[in-house]
């Protein structure tokens, strides 16, 4: 039987015949058990966590992770150097910023070290897996008697992010939401001075630099209205 050789040239599946040979079900060995899926997220392009469900293994197993980048200067196979653990069993790998190359195909291989033929290789587009930090420093400016402008900051390249603003008054049962492009500002043209407003924002790495589906966490809310400070009606900063 072949042994698994990690080769980053796109044809890393050296054990195909073993797995594709038809075998009677009573002869299936542990090496045919599927490995858990690996799910990776890149947090603000500062670090990446690739995790798997270690409890899906029939017995506690310290699975190992290798990775490389396809068709690039970084195509050398790398071992995970910083494992994440769940109940003392490997359940993930953390990669640091210098190991993240957003626009190269990321190849990740999970393997059972006790059964080297038992391996699974996935390919990922990291630019679709970026989750930015929540927006910060929300501020409200009164542009006119009835118009408010909400501004915020992101700890990332602003042009890469789109945003979702939600707001409601104390009288509302649900949030009203509005999509905002990379400009990270939002105007509410008609404000009722008798009501108290709450605003919050979240951001996503989409569509200019990637096609991420996952939003950041919500920002801390900021409030405006009848029971906020009257000392400076033109500027309210973040109220946690």
């Amino acid at each position: 039987l072949n042994t698994t050789i990690l080769t980053p040239n796109g044809n890393e599946d050296t054990t195909a015949d073993f797995f594709l040979t038809t075998m009677p079900t009573d002869s299936l060995s542990v090496s045919t058990l599927p490995l858990p899926e690996v799910q990776c997220f890149v947090f603000n392009v500062e670090y990446m966590n690739c995790t798997w469900n270690s409890s899906s293994e029939p017995q506690p197993t310290n699975l190992t992770l290798h990775y490389w980048y396809k068709n690039s200067d970084n195509d050398k196979v790398q071992k995970c150097s910083h494992y994440l653990f769940s109940e003392e069993i490997t359940s993930g790998c953390q990669l640091q910023k210098k190991e993240i190359h957003l626009y190269q195909t990321f190849v990740v291989q999970l393997q059972d070290p006790r059964e080297p033929r038992r391996q699974a290789t996935q390919m990922l587009k990291l630019q679709n897996l970026v989750i930015p930090w929540a927006p910060e420093n929300l501020t409200l400016h009164k542009l006119s008697e009835s118009q408010l402008e909400l501004n915020w900051n992101n700890r990332f390249l602003n042009h890469c992010l789109e945003h979702l603003v939600q707001y409601r008054t104390d009288w509302d049962h649900s949030w009203t939401e509005q999509s905002v492009d990379y400009r990270h500002k939002f105007s509410l043209p008609s404000v009722d001075g008798q009501k108290r407003y709450t605003f919050r924002v979240r951001s996503r790495f989409n569509p200019l630099c990637g096609s991420a589906q996952h939003w950041s966490e919500w920002s801390h809310p900021i409030h405006w209205g009848s029971n906020t400070s009257k000392e400076n009606p033109f500027l309210f900063a973040l109220e946690a």
């Epitope: 195909a16 797995f19 290789t121 390919m123």
Partner: nanobody, 126 residues
Framework: QVQLVESGGGLVQAGGSLRLSCAAS????????MGWFRQAPGKEREFVAV???????FYTDSVEGRFTFSRDNAKNAVYLEMNDLQPEDTAVYYC????????????????????WGRGTQVTVSS
């Protein structure tokens, strides 16, 4: 019972094109990672192209820019458009499906796939 049936193979001259189809019955492919693999005589089965159910697509180096993987969930089918075919593309082409939890999972390892078709022969003459 799950069945994957490939079609569209044949004999073509170098530089020609073919479109392979893979139709599924007994299971919806909409949340499966899908793969095309090939096996030439006397060689290992190798991955050609893979697609997550979220739509991320990847190709082996030798077919990048020549082959295009697509899927039609309404027809429960996937396709492999092959252009500028070369004699080294001669092989039996297999379609495979892997149930996955995450929209981004795209396996290039054949042992990760649960369901396989019987294959369709592609022969490219020089």
């Amino acid at each position: 019972q799950v069945q994957l049936v490939e079609s569209g193979g044949g004999l073509v001259q170098a530089g020609g094109s073919l479109r392979l189809s893979c139709a599924a019955s007994g299971r919806s492919l909409s949340r499966d990672a899908m793969g095309w693999f090939r096996q030439a005589p006397g060689k290992e089965r190798e991955f050609v192209a893979v697609m997550s159910w979220g739509g991320d697509t990847f190709y082996t180096d030798s077919v990048e820019g020549r082959f295009t993987f697509s899927r039609d969930n309404a027809k429960n089918a996937v396709y492999l458009e092959m252009n500028d075919l070369q004699p080294e593309d001669t092989a039996v082409y297999y379609c495979a499906a892997a149930p996955t939890s995450f929209a981004t999972t795209a396996y290039s390892s054949s042992n990760s796939y649960s369901y396989w078709g019987r294959g369709t022969q592609v022969t490219v003459s020089s």
